[in-house]
């Protein structure tokens, strides 16, 4: 920062509120799309642009003239694999985190018009070209289409779709939020000759309902019904088809080929969790059990002559845990080397850090190429040469990201491409190759303002700089910034890292109330080296708070002795941790004791209640957004992947004992504020609910505020503004603040 | 059994508006399209459009400007009507399941004779 | 609009081979499908699919018909040929509209 040390005497305008709600400073994105081994498409007032990635010369791909007259508002493009055709999205309805529908129109690049004869429904739920040339498979109504030529009619692929039932290319809520993260169950094959789906049959489903107010001219309230399986409630089934899309008729009905999970997953309930081609005639999926300790990888070759997929039992690979759950959230996918015969995959290691290892399709046993006391993050790309990597082994800080590559001949000759290179400003990296891995964008989004620039794989060269917001770092000369503190203490022999975001002028000797921000949910991370502008940076510019964030046991990235130690027992060590943090802040001399304060959102908010709720009295006050309150209201595989099911044979009594509700009457001792949207759908609104029907029960006065027909974002413009004005209010009042 | 059986007027007059009926048994007509093709005395064959499930018409160029395909799905029919009628559009009428654009049933055909 | 030629008369003795060829005047594959379809009319009958895709016999089509070909030029060849066959064999595109049909190959017996 310019000017002075002494606060008092730094005119610079602080960050405010308004600033963080109005997004006053903006940071610059180079959002690029990679559409062959050396070109990207790059969006430039509005202009799509075709960049030469060596030489970094452009020429226009398509005009930002070329829609005027086509009366929609265009909200996304896809451009098809062979540069024919360029897919329009347009009436985007959001429904889930990942899931829209929306309507689509196919332009021809060649004939320069819009393909006006066999157009895509209206309310697709998803489309995705197949990854050469231009064939297009979409879903409608739960069902399954494809289009082998853009201006031709569709091969109707599945039959069976049924809204909230069966769900034929596309996943159900807890698939789409818990396993998948994302809308899509299709996955074409490299070259386009098939396309494997899932489906997922919902029929025993429990509904969660709530109601949604809408227009206030709507005299009954809708009632929305979701398929949303609770921890121990009935679960969606799966199953598993592949269709060979060059054998489609245009008489008889398409014939797709199923593939049963493995035997030791049809003994109970399971779930189908990763589907990777490794070549054109070869698929792996990953199954997870229920209890999800246990998956196993099947390895499919398509049978020419039968028609059929064949799993041979010899190349079944059986990923446990004997300490926890399989993952991070769920079995890591493999990496297929060029000829499908072996793959590269991330797994724990003994000691219980999650590495590298490569496995050969016929053999049980695989082999570590990376090993330590840190962990792999991704596996970003891997060529005949080098396999490259993102992870946090740089300087031993579990908060960093770095893009290493690693000699597939030699696995003792590991590069760092990007430790070097910015040192200062630069500890947080992701990526994005180039389709043969010959090009590469680094991301650098902290602790400096974020830097994007392209490289080459020839050599590691830095070709040149595509964003560098030198116009925000301008801008914010004239801000009184806060600065950020990332560092550990030691508990218990062990390491845990936290960060501090410290009010401009930070001098030690002064006493400065605190916010714990927290989230420590299984395998979470607060304490990073990543550059924000956000609440906490209007809490600390303006109104001189410390806002702090603390990884204890339950986080992630640091091995699984850290993260498994809250295995079948949420509620309990991460809440602790927060405590114990808050504790050893306290002790750090320019903490104000008495103003201690505690806020986090989803599993954060349960973590601020369950602490709120201790009768530690650390802390003076606290809020919660879309809190969790008690764990059989969550969906069940999140759920059931860190608590067992709610059986007294299995761990009823700790679902039990780790209610928010149990905790009410110690809320006396605290101010509390509870938010939540009516309109959640992922962390229901009944969880809030009961935690105010315990307070009032015993008698708790606490501020509350729900947020009409909002989900667990609060994300719509104005009630966006309102819980951070809302809450900054009460952080305020708890400070006694001005 | 499929069955598509055409029905209408096999005498037209020039200049007046040709309609005919294709009613549908053995499946929902919202199930497949369903194309009208003609057959001139000289045996050339005309696709002269289709009406998808969706409800949604598609015509021959040739003829766009004077014809509508429509349906009744109450009923399990469809219809053409072809206005301005000229000799030039004396021909058979048929009328066809059309799944991919192929059609694989077709009616016995509905004879149409354009005089005055 | 994509145009079939087909030639007009075909006289084949029975129990011989029948190629019946139909030329687009662009082509109407693409790397893996051929949007070419066979007819066959009878006197006083509606037409009936005999070939779809090429070379897919439709249902309740004898063995004895057969499609061939990709891209412009395309063959429906009937081996042996029976008095049943007597017919005019339509060809049909599907590749874009508005679909067009070959003017009809009529089947003679020698």
């Known amino acids: 920062n310019k000017g002075t040390d002494d606060a008092t005497a730094d005119s610079r305008k602080t960050y405010t509120l308004t600033d963080y709600l109005k997004n006053t400073y903006r940071l610059k994105l180079y959002s690029l799309r990679w559409i062959s081994d050396h070109e990207y498409l790059y969006k430039q007032e509005n202009n799509i642009l075709v960049f030469n990635a060596e030489y970094g010369n452009s020429s226009v791909f398509l005009e930002n003239s070329t829609f005027d007259e086509f009366g929609h508002s265009i909200n996304d493009y896809s451009i098809s694999p062979d540069g024919q055709f360029i897919l329009l999205e347009y009436n985007y309805v959001k429904q889930w985190r990942h899931s829209y529908t929306a309507s689509y129109d196919i332009y021809d690049l060649n004939k320069r018009q819009l393909i006006t004869e066999e157009r895509i429904p209206n309310n697709t739920q998803w489309v995705t070209w197949s990854p050469v040339g231009h064939k297009l498979a979409y879903v409608w109504n739960n069902d399954i289409y494809v289009k082998i030529e853009p201006n031709l009619p569709s091969y109707r692929i599945t039959w069976t779709g049924k809204e909230d039932i069966i769900y034929n290319g596309i996943t159900d809520w807890v698939y789409e939020e818990e396993v998948f993260s994302a809308y899509s169950a299709l996955w074409w094959s490299p070259n386009g000759t098939f396309l494997a789906y899932a489906q997922f049959n919902d029929t025993e489903v429990p509904l969660i309902e709530y109601s949604f107010y809408s227009d206030e001219s709507l005299q009954y309230p809708k009632t929305v019904r979701v398929p949303y399986p609770k921890a121990g409630a009935v679960n969606p089934t799966v199953k598993f088809f592949v269709v060979n899309t060059d054998s489609l008729s245009s008489v008889t009905n398409a014939t797709s080929i199923q593939i049963t999970a493995p035997a030791s997953m049809l003994i109970g309930d399971h779930y189908l969790c990763d589907v990777t081609w490794a070549t054109q005639e070869r698929i792996s999926l990953q199954w997870l059990r229920r209890i999800q300790n246990y998956s196993v990888m099947d390895i499919c070759d398509y049978d020419e002559s039968s028609g059929r997929w064949n799993c041979l039992v010899a190349r079944q690979h059986i990923e446990m845990s004997t300490t926890g759950w399989v993952g991070r959230f769920r079995p890591s996918e493999p990496h297929f080397t060029l000829d499908g015969n072996s793959f590269y995959k991330i797994i724990s290691n003994e000691e219980g850090y999650r590495h590298i290892c490569y496995f050969q399709i016929d053999k049980k046993d695989c082999t570590f190429i990376t090993k330590g006391t840190w962990e792999v993050i991704g596996i970003e790309a891997l060529t005949s040469d080098y396999l490259y990597y993102i992870s946090n082994e740089y300087k031993g800080m579990p908060g960093g990201r770095n893009l290493y590559k690693i000699q597939l001949s030699d696995y003792t000759k590991v590069t760092c491409l990007s430790c070097e290179l910015n040192p200062e400003r630069c500890q947080y990296y992701s990526v994005s190759f180039s389709k043969e891995a010959k090009y590469y964008q680094l991301r650098c989004s902290g602790p400096g303002l974020p830097l994007y620039t392209l490289h080459s794989s020839v050599n590691d060269k830095g070709l040149r700089v595509l964003e560098d917001n030198s116009a925000l770092d301008k801008m914010l000369q004239n801000v009184q910034m806060p600065s950020k503190k990332l560092d550990f203490i030691i508990l218990n022999e062990t390491k845990f890292w936290y960060q501090m975001i410290l009010p401009p002028h930070f001098d030690k000797s002064k006493k400065y109330p605190l916010l714990l921000d927290v989230y420590a949910g299984p395998c979470s991370q607060k304490a990073d080296t990543v550059f924000r502008l956000n609440w906490a940076t209007y809490l600390a510019s303006t109104e001189n708070i410390i806002v702090a964030s603390f990884d204890g046991r339950g986080s992630g990235y640091q091995g699984d002795k850290i993260m498994h130690a809250i295995n079948r027992r949420l509620g309990t060590f991460e809440v602790e941790d927060q405590i114990e943090a808050a504790r050893q802040f306290s002790k750090m001399g320019f903490v104000d004791n008495k103003r201690i304060a505690i806020w986090g959102w989803s599993y954060g908010g349960y973590v601020t209640s369950m602490v709120l709720g201790s009768g530690s009295g650390v802390f003076k006050c606290g809020i919660a957004v879309a809190p969790v309150s008690r764990w059989e209201y969550y969906d069940s595989v999140y759920t059931e992947r860190y608590m067992g099911l709610p059986t007294p044979e299995d761990n009823l009594d700790h679902y039990r004992n780790s209610t928010v509700m149990s905790r009410a009457e110690n809320f006396k001792q605290v101010e509390y504020l509870l938010i939540h949207g009516t309109a959640d759908d992922n962390v229901h609104f009944q969880q809030s609910a009961q935690i105010s029907k315990a307070l009032v029960d015993v008698g708790v006065d606490f501020q509350a505020m729900w947020y009409t027909d909002e989900d667990h974002g609060i994300a719509s413009s104005t009630a966006h503004q309102h819980i951070y004005t809302h809450m900054s209010h009460f952080i305020k009042q708890c400070f006694s603040l001005p | 059994e499929v069955k598509l059986v055409e029905s209408g007027p096999g005498l037209v007059k020039p200049s007046q508006s040709l309609s005919l009926t294709c009613s549908v048994t053995?499946?929902?007509?919202?199930?497949?399209?369903l194309a009208w093709i003609r057959k001139f005395p000289g045996n050339k064959m005309e696709w002269i459009g289709h009406?998808?499930?969706?409800?949604?018409?598609t015509y021959n160029p040739s003829l766009k400007s004077r014809v509508s395909i429509t349906r009744d799905t109450s009923k399990n029919q469809f219809f053409l009507q072809l206005n301005s009628v000229t000799s030039e559009d004396t021909a058979t009428y048929y009328c066809?399941?059309?799944?991919?654009?192929?059609?694989?049933?077709w009616g016995q055909g509905a004879s149409v004779t354009v005089s005055s | 609009d994509i145009v079939l030629t087909q030639s007009p008369v075909l006289a084949v003795s029975l129990g011989q081979r029948a190629t019946i060829s139909c030329r687009a005047s662009?082509?109407?594959?693409?790397?893996?499908?051929?949007?070419m379809h066979w007819y066959q009319q009878k006197p006083g009958q509606q037409p009936r699919l005999l070939i779809y895709?090429?070379?897919h016999l439709a249902s309740s089509v004898p063995a004895r018909f057969s499609g061939s070909g990709s891209g412009t030029d395309f063959t429906l060849t009937i081996n042996p040929v029976q008095a049943d066959d007597i017919a005019t064999y339509y060809c049909?595109?599907?590749?874009?509209?508005?679909?067009?049909f070959g003017s009809g190959t009529k089947l003679e017996i020698k």
């Open positions: 066809a399941r059309h799944g991919h654009y192929v059609m694989d049933v």
């Open positions: 053995g499946y929902f007509i919202t199930g497949n399209y």
């Open positions: 009406i998808k499930s969706s409800g949604t018409t």
């Open positions: 662009q082509s109407v594959s693409t790397s893996t499908y051929n949007f």
């Open positions: 895709d090429a070379s």
């Open positions: 049909q595109q599907s590749r874009e509209l508005p679909l067009t």
